[in-house]
């Protein structure tokens, strides 16, 4: 059974996470970014359930195309080089889905921009957090 | 179907610059990422690097950085690699190779390939 | 780097055999691994992709399956046209990495 400094410790790691997804959310937003045209082009793959850590692993498989689509944008809408942020959600993703458990992401038919992705991960993290506290 | 169709053999002196092309038809070129790998005889595969045609972003991998120049001609679809200084080890079959976002999770990996472009680098 | 070491060098078979080919991450991939086979002269082939999805237009008898940074090609049942050598890609970071090869021959 989790202990409360377990539960915790994922607490923080999804805040982080959901920080680092808003933060990117905001940066694609920006009404400066003369590349989100382009950027909204890009299919992302969603998954068909997400209510789990373990679901994170579809988000886990569609961080190499969210880099691809960060390194469109002005590196001035985000703290960070598009290749240290998203090596810093990997690291996080990983220790809230563990390495050993292969889950296979089923994803849904139909595909979704940046945005929507974004999003709906956002929510995904909402939920969790709203569910450990 | 998207083909891509590179150009011919070269034969070239140690020092001499190469440059290849590789021609996307059967789509836009704006909406692949152009990646180029080589195999030296009888070896294994190696990526050299890739461009992104619509900004004309570049990456390399760190043993070709600057004898590589990777570009990309949006007007004909073709992309180009250029090494320089060559040298009898560069001696192999390069291969254009692509990768897109815009469409099914399996064209993001190497999906469409150039039927290769064996250069030969001898004095 | 990431270094993909593929096992075995060479693999030789008859037809009809069960092959698995094997490739190891020097660190952690995810599922960012794809397969690819060569035959000579000819340029390689998309098999699987993201470690475990099969191309489209490739024979059910080719499957991928992943235990943590283990990576496994495995073709259930050998036809004469799948003599080649084949090869795993790591697309996780860049410089993407290809493994060694392993040559699959008619024993």
């Known amino acids: 059974a989790p202990t409360s400094s377990s539960t915790k410790k994922t607490q923080l790691q999804l805040e982080h996470l959901l920080l680092d997804l808003q933060m990117i959310l905001n940066g694609i937003n920006n009404y400066k970014n003369p590349k989100l045209t382009r950027m909204l082009t890009f299919k992302f793959y969603m998954p068909k359930k997400a209510t789990e850590l373990k679901h994170l692993q579809c988000l886990e498989e569609e961080l190499g195309p969210l880099e691809e689509v960060l390194n469109l944008a002005q590196s001035k809408n985000f703290h960070l080089r598009p290749r240290d942020l998203i090596s810093n959600i990997r690291v996080i993703v990983l220790e809230l889905k563990g390495s050993e458990t292969t889950f296979m992401c089923e994803y849904a038919d139909e595909t979704a921009t940046i945005v929507e992705f974004l999003n709906r991960w956002i929510t995904f993290c909402q939920s969790i957090i709203s569910t450990l506290t | 179907q998207v083909q891509l169709v590179q150009s011919g053999a070269e034969v070239k002196k140690p020092g001499a610059t190469v440059k290849i092309s590789c021609k996307v038809s059967g789509d836009t070129i704006t909406a692949y990422y152009m990646h180029w790998v080589r195999q030296a005889p009888g070896q294994g595969l190696e990526w050299i690097g890739r461009?992104?045609?619509?900004?004309?972003?570049?990456k390399y991998a760190e043993n070709f950085k600057g004898r590589v120049t990777i570009t990309a001609d949006t007007s004909t679809d073709t992309a180009y690699m250029e090494l320089s200084s060559l040298r009898s080890e560069d001696t192999a079959v390069y291969y254009c190779?692509?990768?897109?976002?815009?469409?099914?999770?399996?064209?993001?990996?190497?999906?469409?390939w150039g039927q290769g472009t064996l250069v030969t680098v001898s004095s | 780097d990431i270094v993909l070491t593929q096992s075995p060098a060479t693999l030789s078979l008859s037809p009809g055999e069960r092959a698995t080919l094997s490739c190891q991450a020097s660190?952690?991939?995810?599922?960012?691994l794809s397969w690819y086979q060569q035959k000579p002269g000819q340029a390689p082939r998309l098999l699987i992709y993201s470690a475990t999805s099969l191309a489209s237009g490739i024979p059910a008898r080719f499957s991928g399956s992943r235990s943590g940074t283990d990576f496994t090609l495995t073709i259930s049942s050998l036809e004469p046209e799948d003599f080649a050598v084949y090869y795993c890609?790591?697309?996780?970071?860049?410089?993407?990495?290809f493994g060694q090869g392993t040559k699959l021959e008619i024993k």
């Open positions: 890609l790591q697309h996780y970071s860049t410089p993407y990495t």
């Open positions: 660190q952690y991939i995810g599922n960012y």
């Open positions: 190779t692509t990768v897109t976002f815009l469409y099914s999770r399996e064209l993001r990996w190497f999906a469409y």
């Open positions: 461009i992104d045609p619509e900004d004309d972003s570049t």
